[in-house]
């Protein structure tokens, strides 16, 4: 028999300094998780401790914080360098700079293979990237050698920038051939390494012949066996056995997300490359684990640059922006109109003839928005300003819900009106008109949405069944500010970008900004 | 590290006044409600006021309406609360505490108020 | 005003048992609800908001539960720091507390 160690991260999304226990801003260091530098301190310890040991991204290490909005994905490559990372899967983030974003800061800088199968270049595109991914690699381990196969969510052209010469084929029928050729290769010990979320990690370990572990990202799935270390909940235990569809136990593993665990998987292979067994944990990375010093010292060299971006001029305004609580907990406030407007603008995806976008709707509670930004300063808007208005370190997600959902987020929004709470909701691409002296929950007097399937934009009635795309925070996905429906009914959630780097780099693009208060919310009483 | 401190309490007369102060720091002050809450010896907790993160919205417990004013000034991560007719009922250890927001919440460590003649 | 009442006033336990202690609002809060612990001359501590998400840092024997006007607060196995008060708090609007557990060693 033979062992194999695979230390694995996912959805790291730009968190090389340590955070707190909620993956946000680290504020009190005694008590502070993860970081590059915590990181490589556990995966030294490991490294020295066993003999094959093989260290895996699943993708997603780009956007999240300010050092993606400042590095632009060099950060990622130096210091996965560093860490001596043996292979890494493209996640759908990766592509946020467009393909040029990809290339230039990290697959040219990488030492590290990065890979994905179901990912085709096309046109002037396939000479380019050529040999810069590749699908699949045989690494050695020991005296052996493994094969790592690559994926990545073929819903990525809706989620982030891979522009129109490259083809996201379906993850199954992409990796078998891939597999097939590692076989006939003589690999007898194949990982499957990807970013489609445990679903598809799932499909893949039951439908693909061949794949004997399975390592996954972007759905942040949390697995562990006994008693989690954390607040995190487990969604299985880990790992997560699939049994194939030819009768294999296939072992599925994720590390929840941000850097905050190192996932932690032994497995025992015979002399055929059959899993003879399987398990571990994720690690948690807390402060029991000191920072490897000559990391840290490295992280706080390249921190210098981020504390001068904060300060920069980002653009202007001319108008006021409102973003006091008495409008956006009360009433359409024009920096809710903004943000937004800037979270339609960075989901513009042009996927389709028959649509102008794949998404139209954006709502945002007001208790989200923290601060207004005066004009009267030279118009200048920094991020530190934007770090103001939204402090909290959330994402702008997309997720698909039901009209009838949305109906019912719009009478929450408004079902305990006046006391200046936070579930108030902001919005675009939306008009809602609401009547107060109604009961709660029957106060949404009109509803229309603006059209996505039309070559002209318009405002047509909600329709109860229809099932719709809307950017949101992260924070309302999962039932903040009392929105429990739609973390109930979503049928489907993607997280998104850094909640500042999309107002940022939509205020970059303008240059000067001017929203109005413009009839989106309206309140009426009496007969429609 | 986030940390409020609170500071004013003392003794006063029946009927008199007392400022209280909260000094914020290691965190964006400006961002966050601010609420005070007070427990009178041996008593459980009581909420007394809130006001929004720009100051333009303020709650009062109805003990304490038109008696109390709760104010902040951002420039200086400053909470503030201005008792005036006080009553031997107000005996208590007053706090401040940011609200339970996407970070959590964090309280100081309290003043006393000592209403007594 | 949305009155809070928590039920025991105290209760004695042991370390390793499981206590259940219960808040009634007077009318519904849908879920604004939170749960503190306090010990003697400190502050109070938040360890869960919004009836059932455990806070940052807040160990997992404490869980939450319950929506609209009941609402529970369990401790699965007690720690030797459990034991000190615990309030229930009301958000929904202006806030209020319950009257508090004193939770006490048996």
């Known amino acids: 028999a033979w062992e194999l160690t695979i230390l694995h991260t996912n959805d790291v999304h730009s968190r090389l300094e340590q955070t707190s226990e909620d993956s946000s801003k680290c504020v009190n260091a005694s008590r502070c998780m993860g970081g590059v530098a915590r990181l490589f301190t556990k995966v030294q310890q490991i490294r020295r401790a066993e003999p094959n040991v093989l260290l895996l991204d699943a993708g997603d290490q780009y956007q999240g914080t300010i050092w993606f909005t400042v590095y632009k994905g060099a950060e990622v490559a130096h210091f996965m360098n560093a860490l001596r990372y043996d292979a890494m899967a493209l996640g759908n983030h990766e592509f946020d700079n467009g393909v040029e974003g990809l290339i230039e800061p990290l697959l040219k800088e990488a030492k590290f293979p990065i890979l994905s199968a179901n990912i085709k270049a096309k046109g002037p595109l396939a000479s380019q990237i050529s040999g810069l991914y590749l699908p699949y690699k045989v690494l050695p381990v020991g005296d052996e050698v493994v094969g790592i196969v690559g994926y990545t969510s073929k819903e990525t052209p809706f989620l982030s920038n891979p522009g129109t010469n490259l083809v996201f084929e379906d993850e199954i029928t992409a990796l078998q051939p891939e597999v097939d050729k590692l076989k006939t290769l003589n690999v007898n010990k194949i990982i499957a390494l990807g970013h489609s979320g445990f679903e598809m990690d799932k499909l893949i370990a039951q439908k693909v012949r061949g794949v004997d572990v399975v390592v996954g990202g972007h759905s942040n799935t949390f697995l562990y066996t006994g008693n989690p270390p954390s607040k995190e909940v487990p969604a299985g235990k880990y790992p997560f056995i699939v049994t194939s569809d030819d009768g294999r136990k296939v072992p599925v593993v994720q590390a929840y997300a941000f850097g905050k665990y190192l996932g932690y998987l032994k497995i025992e292979f015979d002399e055929r490359g059959n899993v003879i067994s399987s398990h571990g944990n994720p690690i948690l990375l807390n402060s029991s684990i000191p920072e490897d010093p000559s990391i840290k010292a490295d992280i706080n060299k390249w921190r210098i640059k981020l504390d001068n971006y904060s300060t920069q001029e980002l653009g202007k305004t001319i108008v006021y922006l409102d973003g006091s609580s008495q409008s956006c907990r009360f009433r359409e406030c024009n920096m809710g109109n903004l943000i937004c407007d800037a979270m339609i603008n960075n989901n513009l995806r042009h996927t389709d003839e028959m649509f102008w976008n794949h998404v139209s709707m954006c709502i945002l509670n007001g208790g989200g928005i923290r601060s207004p930004i005066d004009e009267r300063n030279n118009g200048t808007i920094t991020w530190e300003n934007l770090a103001a208005v939204l402090p909290f370190g959330g994402t702008f997600d997309l997720v698909q819900l039901k009209g009838s959902t949305l109906k019912k987020a719009f009478e929450h929004s408004v079902h305990r009106y006046g006391q200046s709470t936070g579930e108030f909701l902001q919005v675009g691409g939306i008009h809602v008109v609401y009547d107060l002296s109604r009961k709660p929950g029957d106060r949404v007097v009109k509803l229309d949405v603006l059209c996505t399937k039309c070559r002209v934009p318009s405002y047509d009635p909600l329709k109860m069944d229809e099932v719709y795309k809307v950017i949101l925070p992260n924070f309302l996905a999962n039932g903040g500010d009392g929105f429990q429906m739609i973390k109930d009914e979503l049928l489907r959630h993607d997280s998104g970008d850094q909640d500042i780097n999309v107002v940022s780099t939509y205020i970059s693009k303008m240059k000067v900004i001017y929203p109005a208060v413009e009839g989106r919310i309206k309140f009426s009483t009496g007969s429609h | 590290e986030v940390q409020l401190v609170e500071s004013g309490g003392g003794l006063v007369q029946p009927g008199g006044s007392l400022r209280l102060s909260c000094a914020a720091s290691g965190f964006t002050f400006s961002s966050y409600d601010m609420h005070w809450v007070r427990q009178a010896p041996g008593k459980g907790l009581e909420w007394v006021a809130v006001m929004s993160y720009e100051g333009s919205n303020k709650y009062y417990a109805d003990s304490v309406k038109g008696r109390f004013t709760i104010s902040r000034d951002n420039s200086k991560n400053a909470l503030y609360l201005q008792m005036n007719s006080l009553r031997a009922e107000d005996t208590a250890v007053y706090y401040c505490a940011t609200e339970i927001a996407a970070k959590g919440d964090y309280w100081g460590q309290g003043t006393l108020v000592t209403v007594s003649s | 005003a949305i009155q809070m009442t928590q039920s025991p006033s105290s209760l004695s336990a042991s370390v390793g048992d499981r206590v259940t202690i219960t808040c009634r609002a007077s009318q519904g809060i849908s879920n604004y609800l939170a749960w503190y612990q306090q010990k003697p001359g400190k502050a109070p501590k938040l360890l869960i908001y919004?009836?059932?998400t455990l806070q940052s840092g807040v160990p997992s024997r404490f869980s939450g539960s319950g929506s609209g006007t009941d609402f529970t607060l369990t401790i699965s196995s007690l720690q030797p720091e459990d034991f000190a008060t615990y309030y229930c708090?009301?958000?929904?609007?202006?806030?209020?507390f319950g009257q508090g557990t004193r939770l006490e060693i048996k």
């Open positions: 708090q009301q958000s929904y609007s202006t806030p209020h």
């Open positions: 919004a009836a059932s």
